[in-house]
Interface confidence: low
């Protein structure tokens, strides 16, 4: 299973937990396969 | 102006201890996730550890050949990351980056540090 | 450990050239890998995440793909700026892990 830090930003992107920047800047968060170190 | 700048780097002798630190500014430090990279003289990067994010719990990481005698933490109200390394080696001598990562849904940001050099030698 | 084999490990070309590099992982990786530029002296630069993303402010003769275990990073006509020391990272399992880099330099 994947588990670092950016596959858990990819299973969790379209929600609004993963960080409060997301909310302050009026992100919509979307899956768009943000994965970098 | 997004700056991540890394010190506290030296000789230090075979077995001896050093804590690096990695103060941040211009971004919200407190969602990010940090990790220590390092530079062998010459050599390629190699990962050293990871921090997560405060929402995150701060869950750490390590990689093998460092477990047991590096530890990675943060101090989110100062902005600051840190790296003890204790029981260090010759293999240690590198030079030290801090490494940042936060993924906001559409795209991410990366930033890195200059770096810090460890030298370990009698 | 996922290993990453870069090649080739030099590649000689001449501002104008289009350079392939490329990344084969010991494991499947899905998109998870990015590359980074590193210039003598200095810290690496995110160039591209995802594969096939690049990041903020990357010129557009750069460009990654691939998925899976073989990934590549294509400079479509280079500049004098881009020689340098290029690496592919993964981020699909830990340890994360880097190749051992590919060398542009001027031929």
């Known amino acids: 299973a994947c588990d670092t830090a950016t596959c858990v930003t990819h299973r969790l992107a379209g929600l609004l937990s993963r960080s409060g920047g997301v909310v302050k800047n009026n992100f919509v968060p979307t899956n768009v396969g943000s994965k970098a170190f | 102006e997004v700056q991540l700048v890394e010190s506290g780097g030296g000789l230090v002798q075979p077995g001896g201890s050093l804590r690096l630190s990695c103060a941040a500014s211009g971004f919200t430090f407190s969602n990010y996730w940090i990790s220590w990279v390092r530079q062998a003289p010459g050599k390629g990067l190699e990962w050293v550890a990871e921090?997560?994010?405060?929402?995150?719990?701060?869950?750490?990481h390590y990689a093998e050949a460092v477990k047991g005698r590096f530890t990675i933490s943060r101090d989110n109200a100062k902005n600051s990351l840190y790296l003890q390394m204790n029981s260090l080696r010759a293999e240690d001598t590198a030079v030290y980056y801090c490494?940042?990562?936060?993924?906001?849904?559409?795209?991410?940001?990366?930033?890195w540090g200059q770096g810090t050099l460890v030298t370990v030698s009698s | 450990e996922i290993v990453l084999t870069q090649s080739p490990a030099t590649l000689s070309l001449s501002p104008g050239e289009r350079a392939t590099l490329s990344c084969k992982a010991s494991k499947r990786v899905t998109t998870y890998v990015s590359w980074y530029q590193q210039k003598p002296g200095q810290a690496p630069r995110l160039l591209i995440y995802g594969a096939s993303n690049r990041y903020l402010g990357i010129p557009a003769r750069f460009s990654g793909s691939g998925s899976g275990t073989d990934f590549t990073l294509t400079i479509s006509s280079l500049e004098p700026e881009d020689f340098a020391v290029y690496y592919c990272s993964q981020s699909y399992n830990y340890p994360y892990t880097f190749g051992q880099g590919t060398k542009l330099e001027i031929k």
């Open positions: 490494a940042s990562y936060f993924d906001y849904g559409l795209a991410i940001q990366n930033y």
């Open positions: 921090i997560r994010s405060e929402s995150d719990a701060s869950a750490t």
